[in-house]
Interface confidence: low
Amino acid sequence: ASVGLPSVSLDLPRLSIQKDILTIKANTTLQITCRGQRDLDWLWPNNQSGSEQRVEVTECSDGLFCKTLTIPKVIGNDTGAYKCFYRETDLASVIYVYVQDYRSPFIASVSDQHGVVYITENKNKTVVIPCLGSISNLNVSLCARYPEKRFVPDGNRISWDSKKGFTIPSYMISYAGMVFCEAKINDESYQSIMYIVVVVGYRIYDVVLSPSHGIELSVGEKLVLNCTARTELNVGIDFNWEYPSSKHQHKKLVNRDLKTQSGSEMKKFLSTLTIDGVTRSDQGLYTCAASSGLMTKKNSTFVRVHEKPFVAFGSGMESLVEATVGERVRIPAKYLGYPPPEIKWYKNGIPLESNHTIKAGHVLTIMEVSERDTGNYTVILTNPISKEKQSHVVSLVVYVPPQIGEKSLISPVDSYQYGTTQTLTCTVYAIPPPHHIHWYWQLEEECANEPSQAVSVTNPYPCEEWRSVEDFQGGNKIEVNKNQFALIEGKNKTVSTLVIQAANVSALYKCEAVNKVGRGERVISFHVTRGPEITLQPDMQPTEQESVSLWCTADRSTFENLTWYKLGPQPLPIHVGELPTPVCKNLDTLWKLNATMFSNSTNDILIMELKNASLQDQGDYVCLAQDRKTKKRHCVVRQLTVLERVAPTITGNLENQTTSIGESIEVSCTASGNPPPQIMWFKDNETLVEDSGIVLKDGNRNLTIRRVRKEDEGLYTCQACSVLGCAKVEAFFIIEGAQEKTNLE
């Protein structure tokens, strides 16, 4: 047989035995001559180096470029391939020689002691046990131990080939410690040498790069990349790195096995790539591949190399953030920079510190945004190496869905006397201000909240027939006033009022306010009664410790059984969108009160007296009267507010002033308190008495001194007093100029 490609000028060496396979008996002599066109050499089995003592290679006597190989008394172990080749080329001729030695049918290995076969447990892999034969057509089986098992060729995945050895799926013998081949010749058994079975793994579980991502350096810094491969046991790993600048002067690669816990089912291998001083050309993708021979896994990471440390804001950095009250707000500091900058947040110039409501880090997070969070937020990035600073301002605008102020102090149901003019109010606070406030109405009987009617959360009204107030057919005549804007409790609010010109029918009124982030509504129960009427004596809000009487007046011919109740102590809360239950239908929430009955010619008057009213007396008072004929109950509710006693205070200061003779002085002293304080003026600690030149107006609030004279100069004191004490302010008035003599003098 010929091996290699024929050259243009060179023929293949020619063997004296023109066969691919030669079979000879043991103890005979093997002699083969090889002729060619240039220097030749021989290779033979078991000693590929050519120093075997028994083998003779001699120059032919009859020509140049000719060599004869001679082996006297061949043995089974001489079986194999004999190769004649031109030196320093691939051109060769080969013959396979079987030396039939029935006493030793297997060719012994070089060591003659034992061999080693390496196997993996992969079901798809086969292993070859190299028990080569000196006879080509032997019946060979494979013995494995322990426990003892015998495998015979099956014409499929188990086979024996004299030139190759015994082939078998590796998992079949992975349990064994050793194997050997056995041949039967004329009822005699012949065994090959023993082969120790070494199970090697191949499975790589994963390859992890550390750092795994986001690697950034500047020119001159050291790059250290760790590549860790986790494998099953009995695995050997080859690492291969791919990186942008392969011809790097300062590159260093160190591979080592890592210790794992005893009893661990895996091994770890580490390859560390180090580049001492990176350059811009080192930027790019770094890939680490771990190979076990049968399996390769790889992982990649991108390394960015910057010319020098820097910091800048990313293009996605916002300048305006809009949010609605209650939302979580996240403002990320989007930056480009190396190394990562120090980040500091400021609000209106004041540094922000993290707490349970705000987190000031790479992302400024406000857990539950409120109106007071509105403002300008400055983020300052500082490069930790170069100390370069960059700042950016983000404006946070917090929107508030419409909130209707009166909702918090709604009476469960207010009753209005038939025929009276009434004003209903909705005070709306919203950011941005509501773009509209609309009023709607519907008849009370169309929407009575009967206990039998199911009221769901999603549909709180048993009926939804709200009509626009422009359409007041069948209802009360209505007029909606133009919205007013008022500063209330320091907030700009929108006030919408609806005027009912004559309270003729009971109805429900709804105001609805809408802005860009939401809507708010208030439902007002407008119950019109021809029944009892409640009046307050004296006709004003009482202050703590004052006495007040609630009078319930009813026509004696129509009503009987007048009774006073108080709602509470904690009336059922009215949830957003729910209708208040008419109190007459729910007497369980009422407390009966003691009262005194008086009568005149036409009316019964039930008087409930509160002596020394306290803040606890505030609340809703209900007068119930029963129709004599129909026995229907009529209820009227009056909300009583008791004002807290407040000691006098004077708002604003009196200013020291200098005035010329003959001019006028006007000063104000505004006092507040409950009960309202009395105001008195003093000059040089003596009570100031009104005369033609000194005028006190508006309950002594305003003091005017006309045509001032020199003697008006002095210390002026405004004092506001009530039973709860006094407050005072002082100012010195200087009068300049000479006093003119008058005729009267």
Epitope: Y205, D206, V208, S212, H213, K297, N299, S300, T301, F302
Partner: antibody, heavy 118, light 112 residues
Framework: SVEESGGRLVTPGTPLTLTCTVS????????MSWVRQAPGEGLEWIGT?????STYYATWVKGRFTISKTSTTVDLKMTSLTAADTATYFC????????????????WGPGTLVTVSS | AVVLTQTTSSVSADVGGTVTIKCQAS??????LAWYQQKPGQPPKLLIY???DLASGVPSRFSGSGFGTEFTLTISDLECADAATYHC??????????????FGGGTEVVVK
């Protein structure tokens, strides 16, 4: 193989437990995940229990669902169910190609249908 | 958390043709992406993992490519049996347990 069971029609608020039974591989060396698919919608990852028993959940779960396991089963306990939880629930074996936390799913169960309706 | 976007909800092609499905990640997920095929009434079937590795038993007509944020699944020599919905899935972990197992919205492949 992997097979889910326990899916049925329940009313809102009713708790429900789904069970995933595995064979042919060990839960002590494989992670298992629950994934759901609402009718006509895409796949939505619910959570994972790792081979060591650590659990990870999607943020939207918010404590409503709990994953636990025995030697051959993985349970998904679901509470506070609403109509939005109506879906086919799949159990899937996770393979860690890169690290202990990362899973793709080579083996899936046929799924079990949970319908939440009043 | 990683968000995967499959911009095309449906794509059609002829038998024997080639179809390309794209999946975009909201952040760098390296090659930690898998592709699944799902037919009506059946669970998803893994086709590709590690962005380009073919799962066991999957024909070589299916191939995956991409790295970082842009990924593509290509089906060549289209067969009728390839009509299905194809989902992409990220298994990138950035330190928050919420990041594991994000799926794309799915792309339906119609074979004409």
């Amino acid at each position: 193989s992997v097979e889910e069971s326990g899916g049925r029609l329940v009313t809102p608020g009713t708790p429900l437990t789904l069970t995933c039974t595995v064979s042919g591989f060990s839960l002590s060396s494989n992670a298992m995940s629950w994934v759901r698919q609402a009718p006509g919608e895409g796949l939505e990852w619910i959570g994972t229990i790792s081979s060591s028993g650590s659990t990870y959940y999607a943020t939207w779960v918010k404590g409503r669902f709990t994953i636990s396991k025995t030697s051959t089963t993985v349970d998904l306990k679901m509470t506070s169910l609403t109509a939005a939880d109506t879906a086919t629930y799949f159990c899937a074996r996770g393979d860690d190609d890169v690290s202990d936390y990362f899973y793709y799913f080579p083996i899936w169960g046929p799924g079990t249908l949970v319908t939440v309706s009043s | 958390a990683v968000v995967l976007t499959q911009t095309t909800s449906s794509v059609s092609a002829d038998v024997g043709g080639t179809v390309t499905i794209k999946c975009q990640a909201s952040e760098n997920i390296y090659s930690l992406l898998a592709w699944y095929q799902q037919k009506p009434g059946q669970p998803p079937k893994l086709l590709i993992y590690s962005a380009s590795d073919l799962a066991s038993g999957v024909p070589s007509r299916f191939s995956g490519s991409g790295f970082g944020t842009e990924f593509t699944l290509t089906i060549s020599d289209l067969e009728c049996a390839d009509a299905a919905t194809y989902h992409c899935q990220s298994y990138y972990y950035s330190g928050s347990s919420a990041d594991t197992g994000a799926f794309g919205g799915g792309t339906e492949v119609v074979v004409k």
